[in-house]
């Protein structure tokens, strides 16, 4: 057992298996469930994380009700198909040959169909609205302090460039974080807003994905910011295609 093996871990994803068997004896970490090699200097894609999560049986969780103006992840957990880069494949199917199209964050954007369903392209989610309610505090947080703290959090914990945090809105006790990232804005190496939002969502639930790191400890000027509930809305570059039946 060498020092190299001790150092060979994945700081950004605890759902991995690591060993110094990469090229030249370098550390290499593979995601559970898929065996895909991951880059541990950044966030792992949501698709690979969901796949890893499904490989470790846990109680199913139900997610929030859908919103009429934006997509909300209402289908709960599923075992996704990921492409070689770890992105969601545009078409997802379950074991009973029911298929549907998803966006870049893996949220269903069409009615469910059969194996003949076509999903021509993976549609990018370019705008994410994270809606939080914080626990009561003696007084409201200062808006500019809150804004700075959340931008710092997304940069330092989730490695997201501040330019992708479009706005932070606050009306006590509701906080809204807007993330925006068009295809043209996202450079190689940039964290995807969908991945950052997923890590944040898991952090808020007390299910941190980071290796051996304490949970999320959010403080604004020393005052703890404790989140009571979270809703995440996803807006795609191309509007979703649901039948009228779903809207009634």
């Amino acid at each position: 057992h060498t020092a190299a093996q001790d150092n060979c871990t994945c700081p950004t994803n605890k759902m991995t298996v690591c060993s110094p068997d990469g090229p030249g004896g370098r550390c290499q970490c593979r995601a559970l469930g898929s065996g895909v090699a991951v880059d541990c200097s950044t966030l792992t894609s949501k698709c690979l994380l969901l796949k890893a999560r499904m490989s470790a049986p846990k109680n199913a969780r139900t997610l929030v009700r859908p919103n009429e103006h934006a997509l909300v992840d209402n289908d709960g957990l599923y075992d996704p198909d990921c492409d070689p880069e770890g992105r969601f494949k545009a078409r997802q199917c379950n074991q009973t040959s029911v298929c549907w199209c998803v966006n870049s964050v893996g949220v269903r954007r069409t009615d469910k169909g059969d194996l003949s369903l076509r999903c021509d392209e993976l549609v990018r989610t370019h705008h994410i609205l994270i809606d939080l309610r914080h626990r009561p505090t003696a007084s409201a947080f200062n808006h500019s302090d809150l804004d700075a703290e959340l931008r710092r959090l997304f940069r330092e914990r989730y490695r997201l460039h501040p330019k992708f945090v479009a706005a932070v809105h606050y009306e006590q006790p509701t906080i809204q974080i807007e993330l925006r990232q068009n295809t043209s804005q996202k450079a190689a190496g940039d964290v995807d807003i969908g991945d950052a939002a997923y890590y944040f969502e898991r952090d808020v639930k007390g299910e941190s994905l980071f290796q051996g790191r304490g949970g999320l400890d959010l403080r604004v000027r020393g005052e703890p910011l404790q989140v009571e509930r979270t809703l995440i809305y996803y807006l795609d570059e191309i509007p979703p295609k649901f039948s009228m039946k779903r809207l009634t």
Partner: antibody, heavy 122, light 109 residues
């Protein structure tokens, strides 16, 4: 724990070279970043490139260095910097340094090599 | 993004105090390091996280600030403190910018 650069020397304009940074007393397969920084004679410090030496090999380059400089880590004991199309303006002492954290955006350099001098002249 | 360091040079007597300022053009929270470099040597880390003293560095060196304004204060100056000092951040490295300040030469009289 120490770092040592090698590969410097006299290079002709438009020439190329490969600099190597080797670590002793520790392994490069940890969860940190390695950096190349240069310093022209009598001038300040200038970042060139960075590479993650854990799983993944992510890299970042200074805008001016993209295309002419390539950072790589092919083994658990060395990081290299390849430079092409060199000009007199590239004459400098080239340092490699180890970042102290696994987060590239919150990094500082707690271990430096002594540097290797590269002179570009005909 | 740019790191602006002032002054470029300062001269103070032994026992005196030197203050070096570093200004970031964007908010970098507390992600700032200070280095000391003597001729013919590589830089040496003095302070990280804007205010945390690196191992083995005397408490005469003090870092402060956050956001965009940072200060390095060296009190009870000694002859051995004569060097060039640099501030540094990697907060915007993905923009391909140099995170080092221009340097401040400290002359101890």
């Amino acid at each position: 724990q120490q770092l040592e650069e090698s590969g410097g020397g006299l290079v002709k304009p438009e020439g190329s070279l490969t600099l190597t940074c080797k670590g002793s007393g520790f392994d490069f397969s940890g969860t940190y970043w390695m950096w190349w920084v240069r310093q022209a004679p009598g001038k300040g410090l200038e970042w060139i490139a960075s590479i993650y030496v854990g799983s993944g090999s992510s890299t970042y380059y200074a805008s001016w260095a993209k295309g002419r400089f390539t950072i790589s880590s092919t083994s658990s004991t060395a990081v290299t910097l390849q430079a092409t199309s060199l000009t007199a303006a590239d004459t400098a002492t080239y340092f490699c340094a180890r970042g102290a954290t696994n987060n590239v955006f919150m990094n500082y350099f707690n271990l430096w090599g002594p540097g290797t001098l590269v002179t570009v002249s005909s | 993004f740019e790191m602006t360091q002032t002054p470029s040079s300062v001269s103070e007597p032994v026992g005196g105090t030197v203050t070096i300022k570093c200004q970031a053009s964007e908010d970098i929270s507390s992600n700032l390091g200070w280095y000391q470099q003597k001729p013919g040597q590589p830089p040496k880390l003095l302070i990280y996280g804007a205010s945390t003293l690196a191992s083995g560095v005397p408490s005469r060196f003090k870092g402060s600030g956050s956001g965009t304004e940072f200060t390095l204060t060296i009190s009870d100056l000694e002859a051995a403190d004569a060097a060039t000092y640099y501030c540094q951040t990697s907060y915007y490295i993905d923009d391909g910018v140099n995170g080092f300040g221009g340097g401040t030469e400290v002359v101890v009289k």
